[in-house]
Interface confidence: low
């Protein structure tokens, strides 16, 4: 009888211990869940900083190449360029790197998608209309909205093979390129209206980039 009591006591202790183990385990799991949310928030914040850096650099660059910059005195232009270069330098001191974990197939898909975009950029730097239509078909392939033009099906299947974060980056890169083309287009239209050696030089520069 005493033995039975002892056994019962021991079993009681074992069950108590295992239930506290379960509590501890679920508490740890809860903590990890909370941490996972914070890790994702950290990655999102870092990605946002990365994007902000890109946007700032793009804006500084577009100011330096704006039509207004051509219509001010050399002295003012020099001063503004110094400020712009200083801002660019300070922006570049911010280094953020958000690594994406990819499997080999996603790695290949990313490489392929990047190569396609690079090829378009290299081929059409002097040919904005064509660049735009080609990039639009690539952009439509990444967009969830109803496309406004042809969707590049082949590119779409490649992008689908990329990691989700890479898909977003590809889409952002295409948006940036299309924005740049839009700006270049406006600049060239303005230049076509103005006469002079300056526009001729720019035209020659543009024409030296086909492939």
């Amino acid at each position: 009888m005493a033995q039975a009591k002892i056994n019962a006591k021991a079993n009681e202790g074992r069950f108590c211990r295992s239930s506290s183990m379960a509590d501890r385990s679920s508490r740890l799991l809860e903590s990890l869940d909370q941490l996972e949310l914070r890790v994702e928030a950290l990655r999102e914040a870092a990605t946002a900083v990365e994007q902000e850096k890109e946007i700032l650099l793009e804006m500084i660059h577009s100011i330096q190449n704006s039509q207004d910059m051509r219509q001010i005195s050399d002295g003012e232009r020099e001063e503004l360029n110094l400020t712009a270069n200083r801002l660019m330098g300070r922006t570049l001191t911010v280094e953020v790197s958000v690594e994406t974990i990819r499997n080999p197939q996603q790695q290949e898909s990313l490489k392929h998608a990047t190569r396609i975009i690079d090829e378009v950029v290299n081929k059409f730097l002097d040919d904005l209309g064509n660049a735009k239509s080609h990039l639009m078909s690539l952009y439509s392939a990444c967009s969830s909205e109803v496309p406004h033009g042809p969707v590049d099906q082949k590119f779409q299947s490649i992008v689908i093979g990329c990691a989700l974060e890479d898909q977003k980056k590809i889409k952002r890169r295409l948006e940036t390129l299309l924005r740049n083309i839009e700006n270049s287009d406006k600049a060239i239209k303005l230049l076509e209206h103005s006469k002079g050696a300056g526009s001729k030089t720019l035209q020659q520069n543009a024409e030296s980039r086909f492939n």
Epitope: H112, R115, I116, D118, E119, N122, K123, L125, D126, D127, G129, N130, S133, H134, S137, G149, P150, D152, K154, F155, E207, S208, R209, F210, N211
Partner: antibody, heavy 122, light 112 residues
């Protein structure tokens, strides 16, 4: 295998237009662009322009702007080059050649059609 | 437009001997992407041009290894290590870095 087959020889009067076709086979038609090049007697090869069959975007050599139109018919896997306001100096052999690959490097004049002789004479 | 200058204009060679053709461009053919789009073509009598070498030194598929290309910037060379009877024809260099793509005037290779 890749083949580009062009339409037959043409004789035209000055001021007229000519349309040369180039039928592609042996590869995915919209994956590569098309170049058009001509070779006049005693002259060097001269690039006329190109077209991307995927979106029909094209670029022309400034020298031919306003006189040349390059088009494609995707359903027939055929590219066309039309030259208007012909003059005697347009007498040449006109070639189509496969251009670059849309999905990465490669291409660039790697396959050529057999050529189409266009004679402009009054 | 970029002017491509080839030399010599005519190249009489002995079968089995080497041959070398030079091509010079009026401006650098190095693209901002780092590639150099300089190609070499062979045109046999009565035939269409045929791609031999693309991007300076890459032999196109099916091209015999006696053909080789080299050079950089504005100076390029096509070499035939041992000329064979079937190599007779006109050889052209071409640049596709700048628009419009342009071609050299050609070098006629003939057997002595």
């Amino acid at each position: 295998q890749v083949q580009l087959v062009q339409s037959g020889a043409e004789v035209k009067k000055p001021g007229a237009s000519v349309k040369v076709s180039c039928k592609a086979s042996g590869y995915s038609f919209t994956d590569y662009t098309f170049y058009w090049v001509r070779q006049a007697p005693g002259q060097r090869l001269e690039w006329i322009g190109y077209i991307d069959p995927y979106n029909a975007g094209n670029t022309y050599n400034r020298k031919f702007k306003g006189r040349v139109t390059i088009t494609v018919d995707k359903s027939a896997s055929t590219a066309y080059m039309e030259l208007s306001s012909l003059r005697s100096e347009d007498t040449a052999v006109y070639y189509c050649a496969r251009g670059y690959y849309r999905y990465g490097g490669g291409g660039d004049f790697d396959y050529w059609g057999q050529g189409t002789l266009v004679t402009v004479s009054s | 437009d970029v002017v491509m200058t080839q030399s010599p204009l005519s190249l009489p060679v002995t079968l089995g001997q080497p041959a070398s053709i030079s091509c010079r461009s009026s401006q650098s053919l190095v693209h901002s992407n780092g590639n150099t789009y300089l190609h070499w073509f062979q045109q046999r009598p009565g035939q269409s041009p045929r791609l031999l070498i693309h991007k300076v030194s890459n032999r196109f598929s099916g091209v015999p290894d006696r053909f080789s290309g080299s050079g950089s910037g504005t100076d390029f060379t096509l070499k035939i290590s041992r000329v064979e009877a079937e190599d007779v024809g006109v050889y052209y260099c071409s640049q596709n870095t700048h628009i419009p793509p342009t071609f050299g005037g050609g070098t006629k290779v003939e057997i002595k």
